[in-house]
Amino acid sequence: GALEVQVPEDPVVALVGTDATLCCSFSPEPGFSLAQLNLIWQLTDTKQLVHSFAEGQDQGSAYANRTALFPDLLAQGNASLRLQRVRVADEGSFTCFVSIRDFGSAAVSLQVAAPYSKPSMTLEPNKDLRPGDTVTITCSSYQGYPEAEVFWQDGQGVPLTGNVTTSQMANEQGLFDVHSILRVVLGANGTYSCLVRNPVLQQDAHSSVTITPQRSPTGAVEVQVPEDPVVALVGTDATLRCSFSPEPGFSLAQLNLIWQLTDTKQLVHSFTEGRDQGSAYANRTALFPDLLAQGNASLRLQRVRVADEGSFTCFVSIRDFGSAAVSLQVAAPYSKPSMTLEPNKDLRPGDTVTITCSSYRGYPEAEVFWQDGQGVPLTGNVTTSQMANEQGLFDVHSVLRVVLGANGTYSCLVRNPVLQQDAHGSVTITGQPMTFPPEA
């Protein structure tokens, strides 16, 4: 028969910094040998070569050395491509072209995404506020992709659409920082919420500010950090927000700023004697020097690792001093589960089969749920194990033992409890007798 080349219809969604698999399968003829195979992955629009297999050999990546095939699976017709450390610039269509005796091709779309950070809220003016004053509330969320949708509402959930200005700027990696400004006239008191939505991930990040006018200023150094943990994806950069209220006439020469690990008191980064004293934490931290004079003591932590998770204390000393602790919660999305069946041939109703659901390189530990085709949870005869690799990322393997009915669908859902990200795989077993062909 004809050589059929198959790819997913839906775009493959990949988070920036993670690895993505562009699935492509073909139907090898009996007696097919890899020596006969020409496999080419290329960018659909520009025809730029991405990766190839020819003369019985993987000819390697022509795309920034970030691609790989699955050599052990090629002979079974799996021509999928692994794209490592996904970047915004990778977004687009990739063509998988297979030539043996016949030839064929299909294009798969890669949709890149990056979650927006929890918005930070600033108020201008932020002192001596009275009912009737006009204030500008700025909602800032960082390092997301694609462009965000921003919504404002009051404490009663009523949308605020007037006097809103939103700007989105892409950095050199193509990630967007979004700044949305709301101008409002204060009532007796009020809560203002900003919601930043990632349209691809359907991820909402929100923050709110409650303004109670006519607070008497204390004169103390107020150090403020987000109440909620900062969630950062492994391999990405995170900003640990910290702000203080500089007095009029404040100069950086007066500032002592110390970031340290809350539990061990290990020094992370410091600023003193009018100078950034640099990172004491694996050279992966940085301040925002241009913003310090305005009271922004935030810390940038680069290439986040699982081991970074925990509490960081921001200590500010000028004339007075103060500190606050911010929690960093590290996360990594779990891969789409792969499903295997044992035995996988000549299955009949009444047979006991073992279905294994495997999902990789996530953090923190996953929650695993099984259900049948009707959505009924399957809890009996499930064994789940999770193993951390040297980076602290977990591989999860969940095994379900079931007695086959006439036919049935078995779904496995791997949930990342921090990202509230669900990855699911399913297998449908029909007919008798039958052989199980795993999805490419």
Epitope: G1, A2, L3, E4, V5, N38, I40, Q42, K47, L49, S52, A54, E55, Q59, T95, F97, S99, R101, D102, F103, G104, S105, A106
Partner: antibody, heavy 117, light 108 residues
Framework: GASVVESGGGLVQPGGSLKLSCAAS????????MSWVRQTPDKRLELVAT????????YYPDSLKGRFTISRDNAKNTLYLQMSSLKSEDTAIYYC??????????WGQGTLVTVSA | DILLTQSPASLSVSVGETVTITCRAS??????LAWYHQKQGKSPQLLVY???NLADGVPSRFSGSGSGTQYSLKISSLQSEDFGSYYC??????????FGGGTKLEIK
């Protein structure tokens, strides 16, 4: 033995259309990828369209995309090339050729297409 | 698209001599290269496929060699029926699979 026979060529005015056919016999046409190749008056060979065995995938040079359409009817062992918006530079002998196993094993004798006012 | 450069464009030789025609690709085509012979007024005939394999019925005086971007067709002890034009064509990657510009072989 195996043979492919092209037909449908002739004289056509610029901007006109023409449909070429290629009848195959003596080999399992439905398992072969096929191409249309043209030879210009200066004797250069140019691949103008390619189709895989079941007709799911078609390929054209960027310069011809949108004007030429390759198709096949495996039940009739026939390959087609629909040409539209023809230009004088499309004047050539058009050959039907197999594209199986990374070789062009079977070629027809060609059909002449002349685009002229 | 991949560019194939054939050389020489033409040559005059005597019956019984040996000739070599070369085909250079603008990028690696991984031995996915065929050679054709075309006599005046006829259609091209396949001589060699996947760089080194002789097509059915082709005399052993023809031989193909090469890899990567450099390929050649050697004809030993030329016969009168060998005169005409020779073309290379690659089959690497997504079509169009381009042809070389041709080499015209004439009797001296």
């Amino acid at each position: 033995g195996a043979s492919v026979v092209e037909s449908g060529g002739g004289l056509v005015q610029p901007g006109g259309s023409l449909k070429l056919s290629c009848a195959a016999s003596g080999f399992t046409f439905s398992t072969f990828g096929m191409s249309w190749v043209r030879q210009t008056p200066d004797k250069r060979l140019e691949l103008v369209a390619t189709i895989n065995s079941d007709g799911v995938n078609t390929y054209y040079p960027d310069s011809l995309k949108g004007r030429f359409t390759i198709s096949r009817d495996n039940a009739k062992n026939t390959l087609y090339l629909q040409m539209s918006s023809l230009k004088s530079e499309d004047t050539a002998i058009y050959y039907c050729a197999s594209a199986e196993g990374r070789r062009g094993a079977y070629w027809g004798q060609g059909t002449l297409v002349t685009v002229s006012a | 698209d991949i560019l194939l450069t054939q050389s020489p464009a033409s040559l005059s030789v005597s019956v019984g001599e040996t000739v070599t025609i070369t085909c250079r690709a603008s990028e690696n085509v991984y031995s996915n290269l065929a050679w054709y012979h075309q006599k005046q007024g006829k259609s091209p005939q396949l001589l060699v496929y996947t760089a080194t394999n002789l097509a059915d019925g082709v005399p052993s005086r023809f031989s193909g060699s090469g890899s990567g971007t450099q390929y050649s067709l050697k004809i030993s002890s030329l016969q009168s029926e060998d005169f005409g034009s020779y073309y290379c064509q690659h089959f690497w990657g997504i079509p169009p699979w381009t042809f070389g510009g041709g080499t015209k072989l004439e009797i001296k």
